[in-house]
């Protein structure tokens, strides 16, 4: 039975040219996280495998940095980065948990950054 829940940074906004941390946290389960996939729509951004470490998709290598923790840092943001991002936690023995973050990249310099948290 899947008892866990995913907490995310929710809906966030950031300035064009800036950077933002996408963060998810899996709680309320003792399941082992074996892999976390980060996707934008249906495009793979990065994988963090518990044993093998990070893989960043070649097309995003210049603008995506791993971490902090199992999160992902997006850099040099453009308006085209606006959209849904998904953290997909693959766990044993529970299975798959998915979190959703909506990022809006604004031209304005008064973009409010959503609350961010770190995984302890």
């Amino acid at each position: 039975m899947m008892t866990g829940t995913i907490e995310t940074t929710g809906n966030i906004s950031a300035e064009k040219g800036g950077s933002i941390i996408l963060q998810c946290h899996l709680s309320s389960t003792t399941a082992q996280v074996t892999q976390v996939n980060w996707e934008q729509q249906d495009q793979l951004l990065a994988i963090c495998n518990a044993d093998l470490g990070w893989h960043i998709s070649p097309s995003f290598k210049d603008r995506v940095a791993p971490g902090p923790g199992l999160g992902l840092t997006l850099q040099s943001l453009t308006v085209n980065d606006t959209g849904e991002y998904f953290c997909i936690y693959h766990t044993y023995p529970d299975g798959t948990y998915t979190g959703r973050i909506f990022l809006e990249v604004l031209e304005s310099s008064v973009a409010e950054h959503g609350a961010r948290f770190q995984i302890p």
């Epitope: 074996t34 892999q35 996939n37 249906d42 793979l44 994988i47 495998n49 044993d51 093998l52 470490g53 893989h55 693959h90 798959t96």
Partner: antibody, heavy 123, light 107 residues
Amino acid sequence: QVQLVQSGAEVKKPGASVKVSCKASGYTFTSHYMGWVRQAPGQGLEWMGIINPSMGATSYTQKFRGRVTMTRDTSTSTVYMELSSLASEDTAVYYCARLHVSGSYYPAYLDYWGQGTMVTVSS
Amino acid sequence: EIVMTQSPATLSVSPGERATLSCRASQSVSSNLAWYQQKPGQAPRHLIYGASTRATGIPARFSGSGSGTEFTLTISSLQSEDFAVYYCQQYIVFPWTFGGGTKVEIK
């Protein structure tokens, strides 16, 4: 040309261990992860795990954790797969197979395969 | 883990005919799917990656399609050397898993 040459067939008693080798040639050994796949007689393919020949990092399928050890020797471009506490259900052909992509574990499709090593577990 | 299910288990086809093999994933694997061919006593041979891209040296009669959870391998006109067992494999979530295989036999 890329070649993966595996060690010869083995016959083992239940409870024993087996160590299969896979010698690589024709490419830069440390640039490609190596996977291990097994196939029981008349059955399908079963993924066992993977090793990064550069760093030695490994990832094993849950089913085999605690029983399988994958290692490498960069001086001889050889990877090894050791399986312990053998039972009759471990009777299978064991294959090493190279991941196509250079320098990463993704995308993990297997472009070159060893010829296979038959391991028979029988009392 | 992601379960890959292939159908049918056995496909009886006459030489020159078309063969259509199916592979279904228990959850989306996007286009992260490969196909392999295996003949008796031999190691598997890589045919397709990215669900639809042929590996180097693979004849054009082999084509792959699909995305998400439903995939198809089509052999447009079966040659005698194509009678074998075919496996699909997902490579987006560890452990990477194979389907149970489809045996293509001579009708």
